[in-house]
């Protein structure tokens, strides 16, 4: 699915970074780690150690204030998560910095934030009805829902 | 899950303050927006107000711009209302919600009966 | 502000009938660009706090029978009882969250006939 045309006029700029040096962990219970330079995958863990440690970064659209949006960096890094299409895996982006300002084809790297109890939900900006979901024996990449698991849980304080 | 445990049934003076508190077991706001809704005797539900405690930032209704302040401590455990200039008619339960970062609850506290009378 | 205005004030049902509540905004609840609507229903008994029962219009919140269900999308939203049980006498509030203040409806009671 093809980024919605009419979100190219809707600017974002960048508030400060909210969190740092968390974890995510799918409802299997399973910690998103690196899978290589490019990609993530999902795995039970027994050390969270080599779990991938996040920060999370929020903007504020142009258009509504109301609505959390996200941007999410590996800690210690430049590799940002990048959205792409549906059932393909997300990137990791490198970028020299965070950018301050994100509007058009940019808005693949951010996500609505969710939260809903325990549970955490990520949908692309790009995409709106696609998440950022764990799959079985494949990379973490964008759904719309089952069979891909879509909600994660925060673990903070991992550092 | 989150449980909220408000504080006790105030009876205040007009003109005074009152400061309700809305403590979290079994979690943290962190990640929650915290609202708080009153309910006057026999009437519907009223949004005072909000606070996305991750964001420092806090809404309010029109109505109560001037008087109410809604804070969170430290360890994000235990939130506050406070509204001032009391009135007969702010006679009410003060409910705090959270369990989303929108302003929707899903874990609400037992409810705080505030009465304003002279 | 977003007026929310329910209809019927109240309703009284027969035991295993259909029970259908609206709520209608004063302007459009839906975010566009993630196209969720932000609205959420709560049941409401005497003497205690509300209780979520939908959120995002249709969502059902964890452990609330599937009889209840949510509807609608932009102005327009209804929440139905598929068949009223004893246990579902209540006032029921609409609210929407798109944007601050946010706001309920004034509710509706629902009784049994």
């Known amino acids: 699915s093809a980024p919605f045309s009419f979100l190219s006029n809707v600017k974002y700029n960048f508030m400060r970074i909210i969190k740092y040096e968390f974890i995510l962990n799918d409802a299997l219970n399973q910690s998103i780690i690196r899978a290589n330079d490019q990609y993530l995958t999902a795995a039970a863990l027994h050390n969270l150690d080599e779990a991938v440690k996040f920060d999370m970064g929020a903007y504020k659209s142009s258009k509504d204030d109301a609505k959390i949006t996200v941007i999410l960096r590996i800690s210690k890094t430049q590799l940002y998560v990048t959205a792409q299409d549906e059932d393909q895996p997300v990137l990791l982006k490198e970028m020299p910095e965070i950018p301050k300002t994100i509007t058009g084809s940019e808005t693949n790297l951010l996500f609505f934030w969710e939260t809903h109890g325990t549970k955490n939900y990520f949908t692309s900006v790009a995409h709106p009805n696609l998440f950022i979901a764990t799959k079985q024996d494949y990379w973490v990449c964008l759904a719309g829902g089952p069979p891909s698991i879509t909600d994660f849980q925060i673990l903070e304080n991992q550092a | 899950q989150v449980q909220l445990v408000q504080s006790g049934a105030e009876v205040k003076k007009p003109g005074s303050s009152v400061k309700v508190s809305c403590k979290a077991s079994?979690?943290?706001?962190?990640?929650?927006?915290i609202l708080w809704v009153r309910q006057a005797p026999g009437q519907g539900l009223q949004w005072l107000g909000g606070i996305i405690p991750i964001f420092d930032e806090t809404d309010h209704a029109q109505d109560f711009q001037d008087r109410l302040t809604i804070t969170v401590d430290e360890s994000m455990t235990t939130a506050y209302m406070e509204l001032s200039s009391l009135r007969p008619e702010d006679t009410a339960i003060y409910y705090c919600?959270?369990?989303?970062?929108?302003?929707?609850?899903?874990?609400w506290g037992q409810g705080t009966l505030v009465t304003v009378s002279s | 502000d977003i007026v929310m205005t329910q209809s019927p004030d109240s309703l009284a049902v027969s035991l295993g009938e259909r029970a259908t509540i609206n709520c209608k905004s004063s302007q459009s609840v839906l975010y566009s660009s993630n196209n969720k609507n932000y609205l959420a229903w709560y049941q409401q008994k005497p003497g205690q706090p509300p209780k979520l029962l939908i959120y995002w219009a249709s969502t059902r919140e964890s452990g609330v029978p599937d009889r209840f269900s949510g509807s609608g999308s932009g102005t327009d939203f209804t929440l139905t009882i598929s068949s009223l049980q004893a246990e579902d006498v209540a006032v029921y509030y609409c609210q929407q969250y798109y944007s601050t203040p946010s706001t309920f409806g004034q509710g509706t009671k629902v009784e049994i006939k």
């Open positions: 079994g979690g943290r706001f962190t990640n929650y927006a």
């Open positions: 919600a959270t369990g989303s970062n929108s302003y929707y609850g899903l874990y």
